[in-house]
């Protein structure tokens, strides 16, 4: 099993541009999670899906952030417009 697959591995963009992060969860997993990690703020849960349905997006109250899970094998996290403080490591995770 390849595990959770994210793309891109690295992203550099200008302030104000749109950024789209992609995630392919492990096959058969029902839940998908997007996290953000920075030195200043630590690890934050942004949103999670169960059976493709967003359950809790309270970690991303800024409407610059949006996430979708159109099917069981794909999710996107979009930032529009991006800001310098969005610089972070973004993790996707999945679970049964």
């Amino acid at each position: 099993d390849a595990g959770v697959i994210q793309s891109p591995r690295h992203e550099v963009t200008e302030m104000g541009q749109e950024v789209t992060l992609r995630c392919k969860p492990i096959s058969g997993h029902n839940s998908l999670f997007w996290y953000r990690q920075t030195m200043m703020r630590g690890l934050e849960l942004l949103i999670y899906f169960n059976n493709n349905v967003p359950i809790d997006d309270s970690g991303m109250p800024e409407d610059r952030f949006s996430a979708k899970m159109p099917n069981a094998s794909f999710s996107t996290l979009k930032i529009q417009p991006s800001e310098p403080r969005d610089s972070a490591v973004y993790f996707c995770a999945s679970s049964l």
Partner: antibody
């Protein structure tokens, strides 16, 4: 029926502290982000702070960072705002509000904080 | 911080009038949210994501706009609509409000 009930307001001297509480009922508190908003007498609304459902994401108004601390206890269905080093300009009605539809979809009735010597 | 400026700050109108309140943002926002507040009461959500009516809000209220400029329109004022209206943005923290528009009976 969604209900938010603030408490803990009162008269406090400059430099003092208060802890506001917001008791939630009628919805699954642990699934929702929560805000604090304040309104000085005769003035408009001012956003104070936000906390996500599991407390991992927290935001503050820039002017209040370091003096105010937002927290929550999901086992008690309660939101808190710890306010330290209070100033006269912190005098206001403080509202808690639930995050819903991307906005603040339910509000409490407010609790009044007066900072005066 | 993204500053929201509402115009007008005060508006006198009569029952049955059509009124429009404008909210201008110093930086572009994705959406605007509108609240109504009556004296001594908590604010009430009217419109979310620019144009969606909150549950229980009458259809005479509508919202529109994009970028830096948004509007709240009341198609035919009713006595219960006289209140103060606030816009808010959630595009970027801090989640600023407009200064408010007080709608009074002419």
């Amino acid at each position: 029926e969604v209900q938010l009930v603030e408490s803990g307001g009162g008269l406090v001297q400059p430099g003092g502290s208060l802890r506001l509480s917001c008791a939630a009922s009628g919805f699954t508190f642990s699934n929702f982000g929560m805000h604090w908003v304040r309104q000085a007498p005769g003035k408009g609304l001012e956003w104070v702070s936000y906390i996500s459902s599991g407390s991992s994401t927290i935001y503050y108004a820039d002017t209040l960072k370091g003096r105010f601390t937002i927290s929550r206890d999901n086992s008690k269905n309660t939101l808190y705002l710890q306010m330290n080093s209070l100033r006269a300009e912190d005098t206001a009605v403080y509202y808690c509000a639930r995050r819903g539809n991307g906005a603040m979809d339910y509000w409490g009735q407010g609790t009044t904080v007066t900072v005066s010597s | 911080d993204n500053q929201l400026t509402q115009s007008p700050s005060f508006l006198s109108a009569s029952v049955g009038d059509r009124v429009t309140i404008t909210c201008r943002a110093s930086s572009s926002v994705n959406y605007i949210y509108w609240y109504q507040q009556k004296p001594g009461k908590a604010p009430k959500l009217l419109i979310y994501y620019t144009s969606n009516l909150a549950p229980g809000v009458p259809s005479r209220f509508s919202g529109s706009g994009s970028g830096n400029e948004y509007t709240l329109t009341i198609s035919s004022l009713q006595p219960e609509d006289f209140a103060t209206y606030y816009c808010q943005q959630f595009t970027s923290s801090p989640f600023t409000f407009g200064q408010g528009t007080k709608l009074e009976i002419k």
